[in-house]
């Protein structure tokens, strides 16, 4: 039975040209995290593999930085970066947990971070 929950940074906003940290945290499970995938729709941003380290997709290499922790830093933001982002935790023996973050990139300087919130766990299938 999957008991874990994923906490994410939730709905967040940031300024065009700036940077943002995408962060998820898996709790309430003793399952071993073997890999975390970061995706935007069907595009891979990065993978953090417990054994092999980070792989940043070539499409994002110039503006995605690994970390902090299992999170991801997205730099040089454009309005096209607005949308849903997913952290996908591959765990053993539980399976897959998915968290969702919505990022809005704003033209003006009124961008501010949304509150953290929890998403109920679920097994992830595309």
């Amino acid at each position: 039975m999957m008991t874990g929950t994923i906490e994410t940074t939730g709905n967040i906003s940031a300024e065009k040209g700036g940077s943002i940290i995408l962060q998820c945290h898996l709790s309430s499970t003793t399952a071993q995290v073997t890999q975390v995938n970061w995706e935007q729709q069907d595009q891979l941003l990065a993978i953090c593999n417990a054994d092999l380290g980070w792989h940043i997709s070539p499409s994002f290499k110039d503006r995605v930085a690994p970390g902090p922790g299992l999170g991801l830093t997205l730099q040089s933001l454009t309005v096209n970066d607005t949308g849903e982002y997913f952290c996908i935790y591959h765990t053993y023996p539980d399976g897959t947990y998915t968290g969702r973050i919505f990022l809005e990139v704003l033209e003006s300087s009124v961008a501010e971070h949304g509150a953290r919130f929890q998403i109920p766990h679920h097994h992830h299938h595309h």
Partner: antibody, heavy 120, light 107 residues
Framework: EVQLQESGPGLVKPSETLSLTCAVS????????WNWIRQPPGKKLEYIGY???????YYNPSLKSRVTISRDTSKNQFSLKLSSVTAADTAVYYC??????????????WGQGTTVTVSS | DIVMTQTPLSLSVTPGQPASISCRAS??????IAWYQQKPGQSPKLLIY???YRYTGVPDRFSGSGSGTDFTLKISRVEAEDVGVYYC?????????FGGGTKVEIK
Amino acid sequence: EVQLQESGPGLVKPSETLSLTCAVSGYSMTSDYWNWIRQPPGKKLEYIGYISYSGRTYYNPSLKSRVTISRDTSKNQFSLKLSSVTAADTAVYYCARGDYSNYGGAMYDWGQGTTVTVSS
Amino acid sequence: DIVMTQTPLSLSVTPGQPASISCRASQGVSTTIAWYQQKPGQSPKLLIYSASYRYTGVPDRFSGSGSGTDFTLKISRVEAEDVGVYYCQQYYSSPFTFGGGTKVEIK
């Protein structure tokens, strides 16, 4: 130029242990990760597992109870042991190199492969 | 495990003509796809990684596309030296898995 060369017995008896070595030349095994893949006759490629630059291993769950991958960095080689073999383990066995940072799970340097037949 | 299904099983192409190979994943794999070419009597060679990026030294007649579950390898103008079996591979999650292969022959 990096070269990988598999070696080991071409014939193994059922229930015995298959042992293969992959010698790496032209590159130090202290970075990247090092894989074993096999291809049974007429079937698709099957991923066996890897040993990382730090010595951590991953094994395909379908083979996990029978597989051991180890390395000898002083000889710049890594090895595969597969126990309790049956005819279903007859295959061409390949070793291959991966660079996770740049290419993820895509493997870009392969040995020429060695054929192992399990038969009494 | 993620199952990779390739079509067609084989392909006979006239030199200079295009060829297209499809690969479908049993679940979404984002863009974590590699393509390999295995010439007769040789080991596989990496052609494409991250679904659409050509590996060093691979001719530009080879291209990859797709994301999610559906991927394509295209050869814009097939040459005699392109004969062999082509495999897709996913590395979205472990264990990495391969398609069954597509054999390309020259007419």
